[in-house]
Amino acid sequence: QDSRGCARWCPQDSSCVNATACRCNPGFSSFSEIITTPMETCDDINECATLSKVSCGKFSDCWNTEGSYDCVCSPGYEPVSGAKTFKNESENTCQDVDECQQNPRLCKSYGTCVNTLGSYTCQCLPGFKLKPEDPKLCTDVNECTSGQNPCHSSTHCLNNVGSYQCRCRPGWQPIPGSPNGPNNTVCEDVDECSSGQHQCDSSTVCFNTVGSYSCRCRPGWKPRHGIPNNQKDTVCEDMTFSTWTPPPGVHSQTLSRFFDKVQDLGRDYKPGLANNTIQSILQALDELLEAPGDLETLPRLQQHCVASHLLDGLEDVLRGLSKNLSNGLLNFSYPAGTELSLEVQKQVDRSVTLRQNQAVMQLDWNQAQKSGDPGPSVVGLVSIPGMGKLLAEAPLVLEPEKQMLLHETHQGLLQDGSPILLSDVISAFLSNNDTQNLSSPVTFTFSHRSVIPRQKVLCVFWEHGQNGCGHWATTGCSTIGTRDTSTICRCTHLSSFAVLMAHYDVQEEDPVLTVIT
């Protein structure tokens, strides 16, 4: 007990009344007003509770404190008086804060700040919406994926920030009068092939497809190694080059060098280069036959095989390349005497004559083209004087009936053996490769070396044998007339031709040798 008469056991937040009693401090309450035992407690009174008589007024909040309370302006409001806290409604000076004015960047990009009582909202620009997880942030609305399908089916929707476009799909274009972009855009397929908007390589032909196009190898061409056909990036090579390779089993550096040149030309070939490529091939052939190098060391039969292979391949390559030439007449000649004459025309109804130094060819234009082939008609003649180097002692195989006739009118083949090649070897070709049976014959007039008197002159062609070699033959070719240095031949097919002098001894005047010129 306190001598001054005050209880020393009063609980927390209370004060003594006398030596035996205590009372809770203001803002606290106990079960009874006067506390007489130390077991009782003083608890904080929540002045802000709903039944409380405290009223802070509008735009404010009541904050309970230990033993007391404070009135404060609600968020988004501030006191005009400047006092942060107050005790009752009469002291309340709270008014709305304009956050939009205080902080213009409150709504970040693409939104507009709108002040509200005690707060603000962000209003998004057209094409934007509030982000659910951050209601103050406007994000782009993807109209293309929102299920609105705002574009016509011929277009594709292109979302961009705050907007979208209806663009023609690749390979399509706006229909006449339609815009390209707005939501009323309507498109139609572009024919890239006829409009020239394609990227097809010149070795291919453009084919239009819905909304796109593809590039296919030209007829007679194949895709380059590893590149598929029918793609936009398809690149093709002329098959004629790929098949013209050295004959198997022939070992010659000179020939290998020639075919290396041919393959290089094939690799670099584009139809626009047809003229140059033809010239380069003939230049290479001219050089090969001017200087056959180690071909001279090959056995005779192999030399004939090489000649056969060169003649066959040259004809195919020239036929293929000449289809890409423009209309007109071409003449090329080379140092060693190789000569090419070519005429390219759209179908014409007349005969064509190709003239060269040592040979003239005459035939009907309508032989040149296969029916149904839309390309130009080509007639070509190549004179290859040097080919005779490889055809020395090449055999002549006569049809049995011609053999018999010769034995009747001549004493027989002299012991000297192989016939002599009098003329250049010439090769004739058409765009039409089906030339085994011409509807009207072709006529050749050869200039050649002098004929030894009393020797038989024959018009012959080179027949490519099954073994890849060949021989001279007369089937389908007849000698129309001959004199000392010229002979006229008529044939019902095309190939490589020449005039031979066979070692027959003519016994009496031979009607076949009579001049018909």
Partner: antibody, heavy 118, light 107 residues
């Protein structure tokens, strides 16, 4: 008629160069190759090379590469041969010739004597 | 290179006699051979092409023959105007090569 007229004889010093000409007439200059031959005193003939006037295409005997250079002027129908770094070994008569239909020489020039002497 | 060998550098034959000049190639030249006649102080003149073809302007007493590697120029009934040097030339391969020449004299 077909003629190949060559330039006159030349006397040149060792190490010098000489250019001899061959004027063609009587045939189409661009249709045939023009060949050059050398004939040293009391010796045989050697083929030097040719020029094809149509496109200026040339071909040389390996032995004469670097020694002879062939050119042609279509407007004057003249073929030329320049010989460089001359030594006494190059003293010879030089002939130009027209190639026949095959690779023999059917018409020859008059010949130009080149003498290399100090 | 193909070597052309003319066995005789000189041949002395009596007037009206028969002459045979030979030419041998180091490889087959398949008749791609020419013969030339060169008179002193003149350019060579094409005499025979393709081993057997006599050029116009030469009399028929000149003839050529042969095959493979071996070739022959024959002159029957030799005349004084035939005194000259005769050369063979192969045109099968580049470089074109000539024989060393055969000088014909009258004994």
């Amino acid at each position: 008629q077909v003629q190949l007229q060559q330039s006159d004889a030349e006397l040149v010093k060792p190490g010098a160069s000489v250019k001899i000409s061959c004027k063609v007439s009587g045939f189409s200059f661009t249709d045939h190759t023009i060949h050059w031959m050398r004939q040293r005193p009391e010796q045989g003939l050697e083929w030097i090379g040719y020029i094809y006037p149509t496109d200026g295409n040339t071909r040389y005997n390996e032995k004469f590469k670097g020694k002879a250079s062939l050119t042609a002027d279509k407007s004057s129908t003249t073929a030329y041969m320049q010989l460089s770094s001359l030594t006494s070994e190059d003293s010879a008569v030089y002939f130009c010739a027209k190639r026949g239909y095959y690779w023999y020489f059917d018409v020859w020039g008059t010949g130009t004597t080149v003498t290399v002497s100090s | 290179d193909i070597q052309m060998t003319q066995a005789s550098s000189y041949l002395s034959v009596s007037l009206g006699g028969r002459v045979t000049i030979t030419c041998k190639a180091s490889d087959h030249i398949n008749n791609w051979l020419a013969w030339y006649q060169q008179k002193p102080g003149n350019a060579p003149r094409l005499l025979i092409s393709h081993a057997t073809n006599l050029e116009t302007g030469f009399p028929s007493r000149f003839s050529g023959s042969g095959s493979g590697k071996d070739y022959t120029l024959s002159i029957t009934s030799l005349q004084t105007e035939d005194v000259a040097t005769y050369y063979c030339q192969q045109y099968w391969n580049i470089p074109y090569t000539f024989g060393g020449g055969t000088k014909l004299e009258i004994e």
